[in-house]
């Protein structure tokens, strides 16, 4: 843990047992800000979360400390190390002087917290626009105007071919200067990200001559998800869903190539289904068979009534707020016509259960049901449209006999989860149950999928 971050562990000698953060409250960090203000948002930078917490539950509450003496609870939050947590605070409407961050994760590390005021806060009346200073190594000559006022472009004319230059940007606010930005290294005469030429040796995957994310070629000249880039300068196109199944998208694009089954495996789609909550608007039978390729997984959807129920089952008989208050559990059972030894369970989503006012990710609990009606738990899995379909590998305990799975049970707690298909992935031409039943003098025949007699030839 870094000196620059806070963690419940940070006050503890590394050779001692770290303190527990006991439920229900856990440990908390209290931070006070220099100026009390009416907030518009709160941003928190987290640098470490234990894997046990899976981003949800690590921060089990954040309280705003109001000047009036009130503590305003924002509830549990999902935190990630690669993205700061930003919470909009539209309705607070009163001055806040500090925050308390509660955690059940004794390893959680918090780097910084920022309270942003609403517009036209009196504190900002004296503010001047930010200025930027460019710093170079080797240093720029004294007469070069390296402080940028309203324009943000700096041109360096004093360069020698083959020389290595490093540049940093410093932000100036009044008389205060920021820490320098991360350095950019440039060898004069050689390529750089943004020159339209792909320098593979520098890790570039594309170069479209700009520094914009979201156009297929990122700020750092990396190809973005669902895009394919060709030529120099790069021309990028969004390939997912264009109707053409290209070789590179066979494994990733359901819309263009259908569901991908790796070699050596067989995917069996549900032949029957039963569900916990259904009516004419959300019948359970729609999850039978392969999912419709046209369905895109959507996130933060609060009205699932629009065209989803023809392709996917969701529990339409209960509203989201009600289900949360009543702590309702929803489930579906997908049955398969050929019981098999499962290698994986595949769950196709049309919505991932996220709610527009919330950062919480929904989880599903998955069980396999074998031909003897025994249940085999495959654990809890986080739902995300970014990871769709969800492929849950089945790990077999080799000290136990193999079993044939005939059904999958999926349970969850949000009626905003819509599932369009469930598949049982098994081994093609290979059945461990039959294999393990072969007697002495028999061998398993993949072609016949049974035990056959064999005789050793001398």
């Amino acid at each position: 843990s870094s000196v620059r971050t806070w963690s419940p562990n940070s006050a503890v000698n590394p050779h001692t047992v770290p303190p527990a953060c006991p439920e229900p409250q856990g440990c908390y960090l209290e931070l006070e800000f220099l100026y009390p203000l009416v907030p518009e948002s709160l941003t928190i930078w987290v640098t470490f979360v234990s894997t046990d917490w899976d981003s949800s539950g690590a921060v089990n509450d954040i309280k705003l400390l109001a000047v009036s003496g009130k503590n305003i609870s924002l509830g549990p939050q999902n935190v990630f190390c690669d993205v700061p947590l930003t919470i909009r605070l539209w309705d607070v409407g009163e001055e806040v002087y500090g925050i308390q961050i509660y955690t059940l994760d004794e390893h959680l590390e918090i780097d910084a917290a920022m309270l942003t005021s609403t517009a036209d806060t009196p504190l900002c009346l004296q503010c001047k626009p930010l200025k930027y200073k460019v710093v170079r190594d080797p240093p720029l000559q004294m007469d070069v105007a390296s402080i940028l006022h309203l324009n943000r472009k700096f041109v360096d004319m004093d360069l020698n071919l083959g020389s290595v230059y490093q540049y940093w940007v410093i932000t100036i606010s009044g008389t205060e200067e920021s820490e320098p930005s991360p350095a950019v290294t440039y060898i004069h005469g050689s390529g750089y990200c943004g020159d339209g030429i792909i320098q593979k040796d520098q890790g570039e995957q594309c170069d479209d001559m700009n520094k914009i994310n979201g156009d297929g070629c990122s700020l750092f000249c990396r190809q973005e998800v669902s895009f394919n880039c060709i030529d120099e300068p790069s021309r990028c196109y969004f390939h997912d869903g264009d109707g053409v199944c290209e070789e590179f998208e066979q494994k990733t694009s359901i819309k263009d190539c259908g569901v991908y089954t790796p070699q050596g495996f067989l995917d069996q789609w549900a032949s029957n289904a039963s569900v916990s909550h259904q009516d004419q608007q959300c019948p359970g039978w729609v999850i039978i068979g392969q999912p419709a390729a046209s369905q895109v997984c959507r996130t933060k959807v609060i009205d699932l009534s629009e065209g989803i129920s023809q392709h996917a089952w969701y529990p339409c008989t209960i509203s989201y707020p009600y289900s949360q208050l009543a702590q309702t559990t929803f489930w579906l059972r997908a049955y398969f016509s050929q019981p098999m030894v499962a290698a994986a369970v595949i769950v196709h989503l049309v919505t991932d259960g996220t709610y527009y006012g919330d950062q919480k990710q929904e989880t599903i609990s998955v069980q396999l049901l074998d031909t003897k009606d025994q249940s085999h738990d495959l654990g809890l899995h986080v739902l995300s449209c970014r990871n769709n379909p969800l492929i849950i590998p089945v790990v077999h305990d080799l000290s136990q006999p193999f079993y044939h799975s005939q059904a999958v049970r999926v349970s969850f707690s949000s009626p905003l989860v819509a599932i369009s298909g469930v598949a049982l992935r098994s081994f093609d031409n290979f059945d461990p149950v039959t294999l393990s039943s072969c007697q002495r003098g028999e061998t398993y025949s993949p072609a016949e999928q049974s035990c056959v007699h064999f005789a050793c030839e001398k």
Partner: antibody, heavy 123, light 107 residues
Framework: QVQLVQSGAEVKKPGASVKVSCKAS????????MHWVRQAPGQRLEWMGW????????KSSQKFQGRVTITRDTSASTAYMELSSLRSEDTAVYYC????????????????WGQGTTVTVSS | DIQMTQSPSSVSASVGDRVTITCRAS??????LAWYQQKPGKAPKLLIY???SLQSGVPSRFSGSGSGTDFTLTISSLQPEDFATYYC?????????FGGGTKVEIK
Amino acid sequence: QVQLVQSGAEVKKPGASVKVSCKASGYTFTSYAMHWVRQAPGQRLEWMGWMNAGTGATKSSQKFQGRVTITRDTSASTAYMELSSLRSEDTAVYYCARGPSLETPTTFGMDVWGQGTTVTVSS
Amino acid sequence: DIQMTQSPSSVSASVGDRVTITCRASQGISRWLAWYQQKPGKAPKLLIYAASSLQSGVPSRFSGSGSGTDFTLTISSLQPEDFATYYCQQENAYPFTFGGGTKVEIK
């Protein structure tokens, strides 16, 4: 029959708190949700929050968060709503209303209402 | 917050008339809409829940329809006891919000 009976009218000074009670009868109190709704003179109805009367879990409108506290006493089949830091604009009729069954909901909406409690905030 | 807009804000009608009140949500709320009737000085009364389900004990002249963003409450044949203010309310997302009300007056 199913009914909700609320406490009497209150007059409060700005900055004070008010606690309104709502006694349920004719049904299993802990098997249903309980809403709190208010209506300022001549205004639309405004939802304040609700409670799972079985577990005590609550959710309130962000507009009131930090000012409203919803609690219950299961032995008395009574729900309470406390509003703190009162201001003149909190002058309204406050209603409790039964929400759906928490076990097997067959209806939604707020199907049984209390008679209302008038709270006047005035200096 | 989801805004609920009712129209008209008031309607004058006679006994026996068919009256239609509409309610529009600022974003989709699936079927999670309820209709209430309120008379002066009284608590509201639930008429319709889940957009179209008639609450037990409510006369069949009241009916509701709609899904997503557009909803309708219809009184097929107005009776003297139906003169009141009607509110719609969404319960699909927090905070639950009510429409501004439609006052049904005697012509």
